[in-house]
């Protein structure tokens, strides 16, 4: 879920000041410090699976 | 009403540790970013930390860089900071704010702050 | 970021130029401009350099872009006599200028 307000962004991406375009925030895993990724908001939860057959 | 309201501050000698919580009521916590920002007295605004709504990237001033931590509990809808290493020039008014995020940049909603005062 | 002046002395009713100045350019998106009473925690009036948060009057305007950024007050009432500073996004820190006192001339 993205930060509600005016956002041009797509679901699950972000906008990055200093590149000056949206992001996608699924990048943030592994460059977690970017500017863009403080715009990521909490991932929706893993879908349920059971755990059995 | 939207609302973030503030604890933990006080007196502490140089060297000690201190938390300062943060309680957000009244908006949907994990959608938006939190940040720190402090205010020496009779001197202007200093940020010293953001944290995202997942709380997976944190951001810090250099000025606290290692000795300071933010963090979230987002079921309890809490931003918390701990101060280690603490120094007379962190003396100050410490606020917390949540952050617009996303295509604006901003802090949209503040708490009341709370007084962190470092000295022997 | 560098704002000018530090202190505007002013009457009510007169109009009021901020000036807040970056070093290298700013993303508009980023900047932002909040107003800050004796006491108070600050409040946010301007964000994206030029949309006027929620509740803030028009008598405020925000305008700029690149590296010169501008706040005015149309007619200074009353309640307007504070400190105001410019803040910016980027390089994934947040950055405040040094702040203008308007005051009661």
């Known amino acids: 879920e993205q930060a509600p307000g005016t956002a041009p962004c797509s679901r699950g991406s972000s906008w990055s000041a200093d590149l000056d375009k949206c992001m996608d925030c699924a990048s943030c895993r592994a460059r977690p410090h970017s500017d863009f990724c403080l715009g990521c908001a909490a991932a929706p939860p893993a879908p349920f699976r059971l755990l059995w057959p | 009403q939207v609302q973030l309201v503030q604890s933990g501050g006080g007196l502490v000698k140089p060297g000690g540790s201190l938390r300062l919580s943060c309680a957000a009521s009244g908006f949907t916590f994990t959608s938006y970013a939190m940040s720190w920002v402090r205010q020496a007295p009779g001197k202007g605004l200093e940020w010293v930390s953001a944290?995202?709504?997942?709380?997976?990237?944190?951001y810090y001033a250099d000025s606290v860089k290692g000795r300071f931590t933010i963090s979230r509990d987002n079921p309890k809808n809490t931003l918390y900071l701990q101060m280690n290493s603490l120094r007379a020039e962190d003396t100050a008014v410490y606020y917390c704010?949540?952050?617009?995020?996303?295509?604006?940049?901003?802090?949209?909603?503040w708490g009341q702050g709370t007084l962190v005062t470092v000295s022997s | 970021l560098t704002q000018s002046p530090g202190t505007l002395s002013l009457s009510p009713g007169e109009r009021a130029t901020l000036s807040c100045r970056a070093s290298?350019?700013?993303?508009?998106?980023?900047l932002a401009w909040y107003q800050q009473k004796p006491g108070q925690a600050p409040r946010l009036l301007i964000y994206g350099a030029s949309t006027r948060a929620t509740g803030i009057p028009d008598r405020f305007s925000g305008s700029g872009s690149g590296t010169d950024f501008t706040l005015t007050i149309s007619r200074l009432e009353p309640e307007d006599f504070a400190v105001y500073y410019c803040q910016q996004y980027g390089s994934s820190r947040f950055t405040f200028g040094g702040g203008t006192k308007v005051e009661i001339k």
């Open positions: 944290i995202s709504g997942s709380g997976g990237s944190t």
């Open positions: 704010a949540r952050v617009r995020a996303n295509y604006y940049y901003g802090m949209d909603v």
């Open positions: 290298q350019s700013v993303s508009s998106r980023s």
